[in-house]
């Protein structure tokens, strides 16, 4: 029961086009050490949405300060949502490895659906 869980509380989120979407994710433990990443889709063809460790993701902001000591909240907000952003988003914890980090555990996934922009 003490093993880390990746908690994605919402099964679905619906957002109007042009708005921002908040995708919630939290860890129940700081161990193991390693980054978290957000992906759209699962399996080999999944698309990287955010990498805590590196990269430039101009539309993504973190809801809390990820560098803050003992932070367990890895929720993100994606700005200017379009219909192309629809899909299932997974918050994934990686274990620090050498040379590469290893996937440790994934959240259950949050389906993002996009509504037409209100006229």
């Amino acid at each position: 029961e003490d093993e880390l869980q990746v908690i994605q509380p919402e099964k679905s989120v619906s957002v109007a086009a042009g708005e921002s979407a908040t995708l919630r994710c939290a860890m129940t433990s700081l161990i193991p050490v390693g980054p978290i990443m957000w992906f759209r889709g699962a399996g080999a063809g999944r698309e990287l949405i955010y990498n805590q460790k590196e990269g430039h993701f101009p539309r993504v902001t973190t809801v809390s300060e990820l560098t803050k000591r003992n932070n367990l909240d890895f929720s993100i907000s994606i700005s200017n949502i379009t219909p192309a952003d629809a899909g299932t988003y997974y918050c994934v914890k990686f274990r620090k490895g050498s040379p590469d980090d290893v996937e440790f555990k994934s959240g259950a996934g949050t389906e993002l659906s996009v509504r037409a922009k209100p006229s």
Epitope: E1, D2, Q5, V6, I7, Q8, P9, K11, S12, R24, A26, T28, L72, D73, T88, K105, S106, G107, A108, G109, E111
Partner: antibody, heavy 123, light 112 residues
Amino acid sequence: QVQLVQSGAEVKKPGSSVKVSCKASGGTFSSYAISWVRQAPGQGLEWMGSIIPIFGTANYAQKFQGRVTITADESTSTAYMELSSLRSEDTAVYYCARAPYGSSSGYGYFDLWGRGTLVTVSS
Amino acid sequence: DIVMTQSPLSLPVTPGEPASISCRSSQSLLHSNGYNYLDWYLQKPGQSPQLLIFLGSNRASGVPDRFSGSGSGTDFTLKISRVEAEDVGVYYCMQARGSPITFGGGTKVEIK
């Protein structure tokens, strides 16, 4: 053996508030969500809202929005449900229920229920 | 809100005979992660509800194997292969696919 221990029965006047507690005895909340479900006499089950202590925020059924507040104290493994502006139709047994988190399925079911707290609203 | 419709409302049963309860949802309960967010609970007289079946077809810990759940999407069934006297009470289906969580109206199972 973890149990959800609820506070005792209450009799309240219309217009007043009631606060019911639910303590996880023999365990912690960790990754659980706690929901509140009520049952009016002879009626079915009605979900009121839930809280995930790790996030600290609650979500509520539209019907109760603005009248119910669900909170949790992780240090004592206790959840609370406060219902305000009570009316006779709020007379019911109020249950707390625990939803475990499955790593691949998320929150999907209530595996443990409290014994219920009867709240009677009467003038 | 997702509306849950159970049938029948009342089910008189003979011990040793099978029984079946149907539950329909107004929207699909199947998530893209492959899970059906449909659970079955039994509330025995004077008691709290207890979990029987979760995520469509998984028997909860301690639940006898005479109980089984099946279905996907919008149509689900709870089956009791051989009813016992201790199975009397009100059976509820519940969806946790969307918010708010909603319950069926209940099926009262009683011995003939």
